[in-house]
């Protein structure tokens, strides 16, 4: 079962001469010598405004879906990744329950 | 029901331009991204473009890049290819398509989902 | 550019034979231990159909004698027993962000 996750669209006023985009982001891999990257001037907005946007993790610019998700640390969740999961308190809780 | 439906096929001269339409219903438009892919006659899929749900981002392979220019409108829920300096190798079928896509741990997984039915374009003197 | 590789580029087989078509991408199409691959049907004068997305999954409505497995650079999809109507030609996909988004070359399945 997959858990799909919110987006969050940032706010639209790109110009016209950002209008497009040749390389998406995802690999850091070797191979990208820079080639068509001429019209990269688009901020990604979690370097902007979305910058603190995920509580714990980190945030991703997905461009075909021109909106911005959180990859969230083990053990939170949520839009924001702003939940903690109860499961680690399990030990806790059973030695309460004594 | 998703449909999409092409338009805008026809035989052109080489030089020529062309504008390819895809009208789409059954699903909220604006939250996929969409691509045009095509098929020459007798061979494979070949992707053509790209766009983002809002039209921010465009992607086009080099064999037409500068040539194609992929859009969108969204209030008319259509998907738009203008092609000028046609070539001979640009004959082929032209498919619009729909992104699906699987959002989840901060992965974004897509695939075409749906495809329209094709329009046939023909470059030839 | 990721280059996609198919094989065979055609097979003949029977009803209710075992079926494996493979698909080699030139560079890894994993991510974080996800797999962008995805695996079409098309039959002649249609459209291409989805069968298996993201290396493993399903479609919905596709039958269960398909499955798709792989990872990194090798993939495999698998017929478990053909039907009359699976004879058609298959296709891989990269679904990277990185475009241009390639297709295999196809595998053409005939009847024997």
């Known amino acids: 079962s997959v858990r799909v996750e919110q987006v969050v669209k940032p706010p639209q006023n790109k110009t016209e001469s950002e209008n497009t985009s040749d390389k998406p982001k995802r690999k850091k891999k070797g191979g990208k010598n820079g080639k068509n990257r001429r019209n990269r001037k688009k901020k990604n907005p979690c370097n902007a405004e979305f910058q603190n946007f995920c509580i714990h993790g980190e945030c991703k610019y997905i461009e075909h879906l021109e909106a911005v998700t959180c990859k969230c640390q083990q053990e939170y969740f949520g839009e924001r990744c702003g939940e903690k999961s109860m499961k680690t308190h399990s030990m806790i809780d059973s030695s309460l329950s004594k | 029901e998703v449909q999409l439906v092409e338009s805008g096929g026809g035989l052109v001269k080489p030089g020529g331009s062309l504008r390819l339409s895809c009208a789409a219903s059954?699903?909220?438009?604006?939250?996929?991204?969409m691509s045009w892919v095509r098929q020459a006659p007798g061979k494979g899929l070949e992707w053509v473009s790209t766009?983002?749900?809002?039209?921010?981002?465009?992607y086009y392979p080099d064999s037409v890049k500068g040539r194609f220019t992929i859009s969108r409108d969204n209030a008319k829920n259509s998907l738009y290819l203008q092609m000028n300096s046609l070539r001979a190798e640009d004959t082929a079928v032209y498919y619009c398509?729909?992104?699906?896509?699987?959002?989840?741990?901060?992965?974004?997984?897509?695939?075409?989902?749906?495809w329209g039915q094709g329009t046939l374009v023909t470059v030839s003197s | 550019d990721i280059q996609m590789t198919q094989s065979p580029s055609s097979l003949s087989a029977s009803v209710g034979d075992r079926v494996t078509i493979t698909c080699r991408a030139s560079?890894?199409?994993?991510?974080?231990?996800?797999?962008?691959l995805n695996w079409y049907q098309q039959k002649p004068g249609k459209a291409p159909k989805l069968l298996i997305y993201?290396?493993?999954n399903l479609q919905s409505g596709v039958p269960s004698r398909f499955s798709g497995s792989g990872s990194g650079t090798d993939f495999t999809l698998t017929i478990s027993s053909l039907q009359p109507e699976d004879f058609a030609t298959y296709y891989c996909?990269?679904?990277?962000?990185?475009?241009?988004?390639?297709f295999g070359q196809g595998t053409k399945l005939e009847i024997k």
């Open positions: 766009i983002s749900t809002g039209g921010s981002h465009t």
């Open positions: 996909q990269q679904s990277t962000e990185d475009p241009p988004y390639t």
């Open positions: 059954g699903f909220t438009f604006n939250s996929y991204a």
């Open positions: 993201a290396a493993s």
């Open positions: 398509a729909r992104h699906g896509y699987l959002l989840y741990d901060g992965y974004y997984e897509w695939y075409f989902d749906y």
């Open positions: 560079q890894s199409v994993d991510y974080d231990g996800h797999s962008f």
